[in-house]
């Protein structure tokens, strides 16, 4: 029972994490205009991994996508591809946990088979939350040296009489989604890889012992106690529980992605 | 079309308050701000604030902070001003505005502050 | 707050003459985002509210003949006619749509010489 607990909340907070992740990667507001330094601005300027935007006086809000490749810095590539690579292996993952969830049985698929999905499921997980943290901490950081880049040189005087104040970014509210989100999934991930060490428990195997009793020469063989590890067959005294084929219908909510106006 | 339709002209005595409405239509009220712009007889132009009324956020001018209310109701896609303690240089023509670049402003509602 | 100076204060040209009018902001209105320059113009006459001409400093809202043209960057900026129609007699309008509070230039008056 705790085995299914940890594996179906292990799926739950995997589920959810993935969601954070897919949401973090197409929101727009992974860095936004620092207003320390100018808080009357009526024009404010946010980006994503896609696209950049600007909020008018108006209410009016303008994006412009990232029509280029080879034009963007290396290090928002490399934050596009984590976040990509961290959602496919999580959409994966999830897919293979749907199948090792212990409360679906599918046809006749064994234990054995099931704490192997779990486990691999659990170690995509793991990496899919690794990949969404490591990308926002390197958009993070990019963030930080930009900062004080642009703090160090930030008034560019124009004839010795008019400043014109540079735009400096801080962190947006995708940096967060992704931080947690990430570490939802990692959790998660742990969680189906503790699931899987309880659908395998360790491998018990019980000697024959001859017991000698007086008058007669009996050796008992105790048979049929050979624990399944989930990776050997046993196709003997194998004690099927089945609570029933449930089918939990799971609400999948993803966060939905504003312009705030 | 976009369109702003402004209430009618209003005499106040000095020390009243006058509430100014803005009811907009063709748009979606919550999607741009309305802002305020007073113009004195003869004067120029002079922004006061606005109401952003997709959130109920605001902004006003210092100038006007302590005597304008910005308010709306997304209900009736309506947009109201209202300036307490009136004065005499208070009598002027009051615009809404909104759209990109201002592109769509009321008729004006004349506000008279007289004894 | 940023200052919107125009000049001249009025200006009287002949009909299908150019007519120029300046506005220089106290800061740049210049936006690093989007690389654009947040000033508008509006034309108004007598009895009406203002109408927009240019926003974004060079970008024409629909409907303005393409007689109407605004240019420059940073602190200063020009409003031109390049020629002069009796409907354009009017006063003009630069405004900062930068920062708050949002201000407008005293106005140019246009007239026909």
């Known amino acids: 029972m705790a085995v299914t607990a940890c594996q179906g909340l292990g799926f739950v907070v995997s589920l959810i994490g993935i969601a954070g992740i897919i949401a973090a990667t197409c929101m727009d507001q992974w860095s936004t205009q620092d207003l320390y330094n100018n808080p009357v601005t009526a024009v404010f300027n946010y980006q994503g991994l896609w696209r950049s935007c600007v909020r008018e006086s108006s209410g009016f809000t303008e994006c412009r996508g990232y029509f280029t490749l080879l034009g963007l810095p290396a290090m928002l590539q490399a934050v596009r591809a984590l976040m990509i690579v961290g959602i496919v292996l999580g959409a994966i993952g999830l897919l293979v946990s749907i199948f090792a969830l212990k409360c679906i049985r599918i046809g006749s698929m064994e234990d054995s088979a099931k704490a192997n999905m779990t486990l691999t499921s659990g170690i995509m997980f793991i990496v899919s939350g690794l990949c969404a943290i490591a990308g926002v901490s390197v958009f993070a950081n990019m963030l930080v040296t930009n900062f004080w880049m642009s703090t160090a040189n930030m008034y560019t005087g124009m004839g010795g009489m008019v400043q014109t104040v540079q735009t400096r970014y801080t962190f947006g509210a995708a940096l967060f989604v992704g931080w947690v989100a990430g570490g939802l999934t990692l959790i998660g991930g742990v969680m189906m890889c503790i699931a899987c060490r309880g659908l395998a428990p360790e491998e018990t195997n019980y000697k024959a012992v001859s017991y000698h009793a007086s008058g007669h020469s009996v050796a008992y063989k105790p048979g049929g106690f050979k624990a399944s590890t989930g990776f050997g067959s046993n196709t003997k005294n194998k004690k099927i529980y089945d609570g029933g084929a449930r089918t939990e219908d799971e609400v999948q909510s993803y966060p939905s992605k504003h312009d705030y106006v | 079309q976009v369109q702003l339709v402004q209430s009618g002209a209003e005499v106040k005595k000095p020390g009243a308050s006058v509430k100014v409405s803005c009811k907009a239509s063709?748009?979606?009220?919550?999607?741009?701000?309305i802002h305020w712009v007073k113009q004195a007889p003869g004067q120029g132009l002079e922004w006061m604030g606005y109401?952003?009324?997709?959130?109920?956020?605001?902004n006003y001018n210092l100038k006007f902070k302590d005597r304008v209310t910005l308010t709306s109701d997304t209900s009736i896609s309506t947009a109201y001003m209202e300036l307490s303690r009136l004065r005499s240089d208070d009598t002027a023509v009051y615009f809404c505005?909104?759209?990109?670049?201002?592109?769509?402003w009321g008729q004006g509602t004349l506000v008279t502050v007289s004894s | 707050d940023i200052v919107m100076t125009q000049s001249p204060d009025s200006l009287a040209v002949s009909l299908g003459e150019r007519a120029t009018i300046n506005c220089k902001s106290s800061?740049?209105?210049?936006?690093?985002?989007?690389?654009?320059?947040?000033l508008i113009w509006y034309q108004q006459k007598p009895g009406q509210p203002p109408k927009l001409l240019i926003y974004r400093a060079s970008t024409r809202d629909s409907g303005v003949p393409d007689r109407f043209s605004g240019s420059g960057s940073g602190t200063d900026f020009t409003l031109t006619i390049s020629s002069l129609q009796a409907e354009d007699v009017a006063v003009y309008y630069c405004q900062n749509d930068y920062s708050y509070p949002l201000t407008f230039g005293g106005g140019t008056k246009l007239e026909i010489k």
């Open positions: 109401i952003s009324p997709g959130n109920g956020g605001s």
């Open positions: 505005a909104t759209g990109r670049g201002f592109a769509y």
């Open positions: 800061q740049s209105l210049f936006n690093s985002g989007n690389q654009k320059n947040y």
């Open positions: 063709g748009f979606t009220f919550t999607s741009y701000n």
